[in-house]
Amino acid sequence: KSSNEATNITPKHNMKAFLDELKAENIKKFLYNFTQIPHLAGTEQNFQLAKQIQSQWKEFGLDSVELAHYDVLLSYPNKTHPNYISIINEDGNEIFNTSLFEPPPPGYENVSDIVPPFSAFSPQGMPEGDLVYVNYARTEDFFKLERDMKINCSGKIVIARYGKVFRGNKVKNAQLAGAKGVILYSDPADYFAPGVKSYPDGWNLPGGGVQRGNILNLNGAGDPLTPGYPANEYAYRRGIAEAVGLPSIPVHPIGYYDAQKLLEKMGGSAPPDSSWRGSLKVPYNVGPGFTGNFSTQKVKMHIHSTNEVTRIYNVIGTLRGAVEPDRYVILGGHRDSWVFGGIDPQSGAAVVHEIVRSFGTLKKEGWRPRRTILFASWDAEEFGLLGSTEWAEENSRLLQERGVAYINADSSIEGNYTLRVDCTPLMYSLVHNLTKELKSPDEGFEGKSLYESWTKKSPSPEFSGMPRISKLGSGNDFEVFFQRLGIASGRARYTKNWETNKFSGYPLYHSVYETYELVEKFYDPMFKYHLTVAQVRGGMVFELANSIVLPFDCRDYAVVLRKYADKIYSISMKHPQEMKTYSVSFDSLFSAVKNFTEIASKFSERLQDFDKSNPIVLRMMNDQLMFLERAFIDPLGLPDRPFYRHVIYAPSSHNKYAGESFPGIYDALFDIESKVDPSKAWGEVKRQIYVAAFTVQAAAETLSEVA
């Protein structure tokens, strides 16, 4: 049923009215306003922005707008004792030092409180030693080094290029390899697109530009000192030694000018193959240590950052639902930035602001959504998704009973090529139907739908004529809602052409050069891509909050479950002899998936036919849809990752940004040939198949007729 039927509204107040109210010029104005000074989590500037947003959301017409504060562990450089890396000679003299700050962009030379590049939550330390180049520091890179090249990183300082995987995974891998320090750098191969000038003349990374970022391995814990519970005024805090996810070795990021100075002297083994070479004019030798003439020189890190419990502020706005006020649709994105946040997060925050304004306009004209909409401006996302996680921990009982959906709203753009969507399969049909109704902003697709341009530019690898929709991973504020609480979630943004641009993320990510001008000059001068993203995010929220029957299609979950079962089975079948020896069978999982498919099909038939004028039956059917995602939650969580509780999806253990399907089975199978005790290892595979099969079967039964 269409949204117009929701709450006795006049035809004017339908989805079209909401979408028509969204204006590119407003998004542009809001972005400018949000990006003139830094808004680092825990600072006065970010508190002031929180209060400004609270005030403006109230003006826009929300029913209530409150600040929710928490006292969480954050990390800052020491203002009087800067972090840097040096090359030292045999006498211990520093013969080269890395830069202490990024050269500020034009027009920002006099801005104060620009935090210098640092790796948030690095411990203090001054390790010195030989350097080992570890490529991207992925699991497979360390396998190559340790197993194939027999290079031992124990007691070494490793240098890794940013890209491919979340930086926290790089640090974890280095720690496990025995390294005593990590240097992270941006290689032009990954952060300098050919044929484009560096900022301020283009959108590429200059040699002095550096990517900031946290290096935690929280696995969904939130504040490291209060895992599982909100960091409120009566919180019990762990000691720092028991804190969750903190790195144990010093880490520091540098740009490619400084990296050149370190890498040009590298000796030892040659790179194993071309995939280990970047674009600098250096040999990309692996080491350990420097070559011939420089072999007595060492690298020394000087890290003096401190971890501090600091107050953060979320802004929570409420637009009460007229019919089902106890059902929540949440639109959330973060407000804190590393520096100016021109893309991350303010291109997203500006879109949320305009969505709130549009909803507020409709509300002032007498309209209300069917369900309650919650709007959130999260704090401290950059420090480990802390604001969203603490709020969800504080409100978990309400959310698990009332949460319909969560739509994430971080950066609206990471390119200007096509749409990118990651979401639960329950939302596939919603996204397809919505994008068919929206106009494409793309050149060459005038008068065509967004669905058409998206499908053409980013086709599904499985289904012809459909666009690619990816699995949810992590690295953003949907994590607690989806991976911990099992609330249906989705995210949308405009992205680059992944086939022609092999660099990781966008070049100026988390640098001082992520400014308003970057967006206005190079990415989206007309703010048409921002407007499209606002329409997608806002349209999803509108439909989720307003349609009589929730716009979830459980049959799409059945399809992907079969695909994921096939995939994990084929991985296991690379070990046919062991499967036979240890009697490993996937029959229970395939049987559960078959049952789910049949029950989902029957449920969908009932959904077409039931009496929608009967509020009890309507509520019952909607609750079955709402609670389906919840049914995939295992209260015990995944092995060693208690806050990742979704059995179908979890962030990859090797890359927090990526989603993995049937993660429990996947991790049990991963590198199983190198596990010393095959009986124990295959026993765990069998246990994980059992958990997955049970969970799928249990989820299927929630869709059965209730009596």
């Epitope: 124990s154 690379k574 070990h575 046919p576 002899q577 040939e673 010393v676 005790d677």
Partner: antibody, heavy 116, light 107 residues
Framework: EVQLLESGGGLVQPGGSLRLSCAAS????????MTWVRQAPGKGLEWVSE????????YYADSVKGRFTISRDNSKNTLYLQMNSLRAEDTAVYYC?????????WGQGTLVTVSS | DIQMTQSPSSLSASVGDRVTITCRAS??????VAWYQQKPGKAPKLLIY???NRFSGVPSRFSGSGSGTDFTLTISSLQPEDFATYYC?????????FGQGTKVEIK
């Protein structure tokens, strides 16, 4: 159940050659690194050589480098050790073992005696 | 190369005794230590890996401990079938070196 069966040992003169084989069963041989370890009569254990699952990477103890060659035929589930320029100090029981670093399953061994 | 030094080289004990064998590495080997049991004329068998993890089927009377450079294998209550030679091995870096062995004999 994992089984490793070495063969090819015997008496050989110094400077001579010998090729040891190890037939593997009970596991998916082509997925695993394999290792040769030897034990001189009445002495301790000595790691000799390792090979990667595809056979693309090989490693040797300094004492045998340049003289011994490890190889494998994954289609036949068989590991080999070609031993050239044999010396008296190469006399030992040669074991093939599954895995690398840590050896979870071993064959029963084959005795190589280098003597004139 | 990393040297592994075992002590004692032999010991005599009775059934039911608690037996401790130590192994010292010439440098820090982190958690890269395994222990093997070998009976005369037989191949070695893996007992303990990564310092303290018992391999499948190994009785609970066998335990491993230690860190850095000093490691211990303990048999809490010696059984008749435990009379054998025990080897420690470092697996941090190649060449993967073994201790010279500790022979456990019947008193």
């Amino acid at each position: 159940e994992v089984q490793l069966l070495e063969s090819g040992g015997g008496l050989v003169q110094p400077g001579g050659s010998l090729r040891l084989s190890c037939a593997a069963s009970g596991f998916t041989f082509g997925n695993y690194r394999m290792t040769w370890v030897r034990q001189a009569p009445g002495k301790g254990l000595e790691w000799v050589s390792e090979i990667s699952p595809s056979g693309g990477y090989t490693y040797y103890a300094d004492s045998v480098k340049g003289r011994f060659t490890i190889s494998r035929d994954n289609s036949k589930n068989t590991l080999y050790l070609q031993m050239n320029s044999l010396r008296a100090e190469d006399t030992a029981v040669y074991y093939c073992a599954k895995g690398f670093r840590i050896f979870d399953y071993w064959g029963q061994g084959t005795l190589v005696t280098v003597s004139s | 190369d990393i040297q592994m030094t075992q002590s004692p080289s032999s010991l005599s004990a009775s059934v039911g005794d608690r037996v401790t064998i130590t192994c010292r590495a010439s440098q820090d080997v982190s958690s890269g230590v395994a222990w093997y049991q070998q009976k005369p004329g037989k191949a070695p068998k893996l007992l303990i890996y990564k310092v303290s993890n018992r391999f499948s089927g190994v009785p609970s009377r066998f335990s491993g401990s230690g860190s850095g450079t000093d490691f211990t294998l303990t048999i809490s209550s010696l059984q008749p079938e435990d009379f054998a030679t025990y080897y420690c091995q470092q697996n941090l870096a190649p060449p993967y070196t073994f201790g010279q062995g500790t022979k456990v004999e019947i008193k």
